[in-house]
Interface confidence: low
Amino acid sequence: KVFGRCELAAAMKRHGLDNYRGYSLGNWVCAAKFESNFNTQATNRNTDGSTDYGILQINSRWWCNDGRTPGSRNLCNIPCSALLSSDITASVNCAKKIVSDGNGMNAWVAWRNRCKGTDVQAWIRGCRL
């Protein structure tokens, strides 16, 4: 599923991401934009053999199990396929673990490079939340 900007903002808010670990909703929507272009089925292979999955491009080396990443830790205890669902529950639950891990949203390269320090509130402007 490819979410609309405000549709995703509403879904993320419903799942409790607004101000989760101090990161406003705009940060999460911005991250999703530059990680996956709001596409829940986005997958990208990394040079180390791991793969990033879903709307927040969660990595199979650490966070999920795709059955093909050597040494996978699967810290979210989920199959990576679950992160491709049109329902973002699995991605959100896992993202909450990731952002609580010490580095905050710096874990997402796209957020670090494209969202951090910018007017992230623009990503939810005009949305009825």
Epitope: K1, G16, Q41, T43, L84, S85, S86, D87
Partner: antibody, heavy 116, light 107 residues
């Protein structure tokens, strides 16, 4: 509107295999999980597993690994569940449902009877 | 696996009564809890998603509440068409699991 149409009732012999179908209409089939659920009298509802038709990704309840196999044909918007090595324990109503975490749309159910 | 325990197993009520059905999870499932109604020889029907969000077309007498491990489905002034089985289901983790059900029957 969203609809899931399952194949008709089946009577099979122990040891045989059966393939149940679930045809989806009214939405983009490839991007939503199709869930499979088993119901036996006195046993409530049991989640068998799910398939994401667009990618072919599957996830099975450990209890049903080796028993159920999911496939999907995006050209006909149809999901399939094959059950193998049938026993009387497999006699049940099997439902497909559209997965959104919750299951907002269900098929009408396929009744499977396994009897010699 | 997360176990969902529903109580009571059977609830005998008179039309017009208000009732509460309980669903308890073996561990915290946040707000990832959904309720279904199933009548005899029919498929389950979604009533409530994410604890308290009413599904499309569901009468306002049905409502849900709770969080974490304890959840309640309330029916305000039961009508005759409400009798049947009620199941809760969690989507917090895999495998998805259902409660054993509560049978709502006419007294």
């Amino acid at each position: 509107q969203v609809q899931l149409q399952e194949s008709g009732a089946e009577v099979m012999k122990p040891g045989a295999s059966v393939k149940i179908s679930c045809k989806a209409t009214g939405y983009t089939f490839s991007t939503y999980w199709i869930e499979w659920v088993k119901q036996r009298p006195g046993h409530g509802l049991e989640w068998i597993g799910e398939i994401l038709p667009g990618s072919g990704s599957t996830y099975y309840n450990e209890k049903f690994k080796g028993k159920a196999t999911f496939t999907a044909d995006t050209s006909s918007n149809t999901a399939y569940m094959q059950l193998s090595s049938l026993t009387s324990e497999d006699s049940a109503v099997y439902y497909c449902a559209r997965g959104d975490g919750f299951y907002g749309y269900w098929g009408q159910g396929t009744t499977l009877t396994v009897s010699s | 696996d997360i176990e969902l325990t529903q109580s009571p197993a059977t609830l005998s009520v008179t039309p017009g009564d208000s009732v509460s059905l309980s669903c308890r999870a073996s561990q915290s499932i946040s707000n990832n809890l959904h309720w279904y109604q199933q009548k005899s020889h029919e498929s389950p029907r979604l009533l409530i998603k994410y604890v308290s969000q009413s599904s499309s077309g569901i009468p306002s007498r049905f409502s849900g509440s709770g969080s974490g491990t304890d959840f309640t489905l309330s029916i305000n002034s039961v009508e005759t068409e409400d009798f049947g089985m009620y199941f809760c289901q969690q989507s917090n983790s895999w495998p998805r699991t259902f409660g054993g059900g509560t049978k709502l029957e006419i007294k």
